[in-house]
Amino acid sequence: QQQTLPKPFIWAEPHFMVPKEKQVTICCQGNYGAVEYQLHFEGSLFAVDRPKPPERINKVQFYIPDMNSRMAGQYSCIYRVGELWSEPSNLLDLVVTEMYDTPTLSVHPGPEVISGEKVTFYCRLDTATSMFLLLKEGRSSHVQRGYGKVQAEFPLGPVTTAHRGTYRCFGSYNNHAWSFPSEPVKLLVTGDIENTSLAPEDPTFPADTWGTYLLTTETGLQKDHALWDHTAQNLLR
């Protein structure tokens, strides 16, 4: 007699960060033969779906046509086979962006630096927020948190060519409501050509300051759910 079902995977398409009034789909993948899926939001039942026919479908989608701050928060899903329910999925933090204002992102000493130089990003927003988020775009989207009354600083320390890329920042009004994104800042790190070719796509940051979101962008990551269960290292919690 089976006593447990593996927990399902949950993710958001196209992204866990959703601009206000835009659409998002929350996906939940369980097992073939699952009779029913339930999506829970902040601990309460939010939606139910029953795949038809169950034996041919192992994923359901919950569509949110119009994102707003009331829909932002923590989602999880469960499914059942017969009357046996799975463990709940990990938590998916769905964030609404483009709220209120736009911060300004700057970088010191400048956007073009030499490998080994110390680089600091500054994110400024004059309205009521004390938490800021710095994101580096790419296959893995790194999120770093910073605090300050109107400005937060994000020291990267001595940079390598792996730090090259496009950065944006957000002001955070709460864990799940973020400002408009800043204008992007492209960081160019020049260095030894041999080192450049060997540089990994993304740098490794100290565990206490950096979390990793593996995003469902057009990177082929959709193929392997285990890789991009958004909540594996959820910085927002």
Partner: antibody
Framework: QVQLQQSAVELARPGASVKMSCKAS????????MHWVKQRPGQGLEWIGY????????EYNQKFKDKTTLTADKSSSTAYMQLDSLTSDDSAVYYC??????????WGQGTLVTVSA | DIQMIQSPASLSVSVGETVTITCRAS??????LAWFQQKQGKSPQLLVY???NLADGVPSRFSGSGSGTQYSLKINSLQSEDFGIYYC?????????FGGGTKLEIK
């Protein structure tokens, strides 16, 4: 072996409440949902709802939503059903039933509720 | 709510005969159907789950079949211990609902 031991008889006055118990043994209580089913004398079976003892999450048949409260005590592996504002229509046998991947696979012996002035 | 229409309501048969009880769902329940047997003064017992699968300890003379909205329980070579009331039940949506029951009596 799996056993669901229910309180045998509950007598109550109209308008009162009754809380019946279902003690589970022989399996991991928190791994399976517990459902409740009503059967009036000489009648068929009606599904009331279920509780997930692990999370406390409940789901009810709309017909019984205002009448019934399902709870579970993990420490004693016991599920409870409370019926409020009792009327003669609530006189019935109430079964607790384990929900598994095979459906309703184990049933308690039933609690007979008699509502009488 | 999904309605489960069970027929016949009662049946009078002799030991050794074969009987078929049918259950029709008001919508497709995708084989999420169970059959139960209940004897006088006892709790129901699971016979068949997921439309066709025999529960543990159920004799092979019982068999379930069907799909979509139409399901049936067949009992070959009836034994005296098979008499009682039979119920179908879906576990597709909420609320779970039972058929009205089929009373199987000795002729």
């Amino acid at each position: 072996q799996v056993q669901l031991q229910q309180s045998a008889v509950e007598l109550a006055r109209p308008g009162a409440s009754v809380k019946m118990s279902c003690k589970a043994s022989g399996y991991t209580f928190t791994s399976f949902t517990m459902h409740w089913v009503k059967q009036r004398p000489g009648q068929g079976l009606e599904w009331i709802g279920y509780i997930n003892p692990s999370s406390g999450y409940t789901e009810y048949n709309q017909k019984f939503k205002d009448k019934t409260t399902l709870t579970a005590d993990k420490s004693s592996s016991t599920a409870y059903m409370q019926l409020d504002s009792l009327t003669s229509d609530d006189s019935a046998v109430y079964y607790c039933v384990r929900g598994s991947s095979r459906g309703f696979d184990y049933w308690g012996q039933g609690t007979l509720v008699t509502v009488s002035a | 709510d999904i309605q489960m229409i069970q027929s016949p309501a009662s049946l009078s048969v002799s030991v050794g005969e074969t009987v078929t009880i049918t259950c029709r769902a008001s919508e497709n329940i995708y084989s999420n159907l169970a059959w139960f047997q209940q004897k006088q003064g006892k709790s129901p017992q699971l016979l068949v789950y997921a439309a066709t699968n025999l529960a543990d300890g159920v004799p092979s003379r019982f068999s379930g079949s069907g799909s979509g909205t139409q399901y049936s329980l067949k009992i070959n070579s009836l034994q005296s211990e098979d008499f009682g009331i039979y119920y179908c039940q879906h576990f597709w949506g909420t609320p779970r609902t039972f058929g009205g029951g089929t009373k199987l009596e000795i002729k």
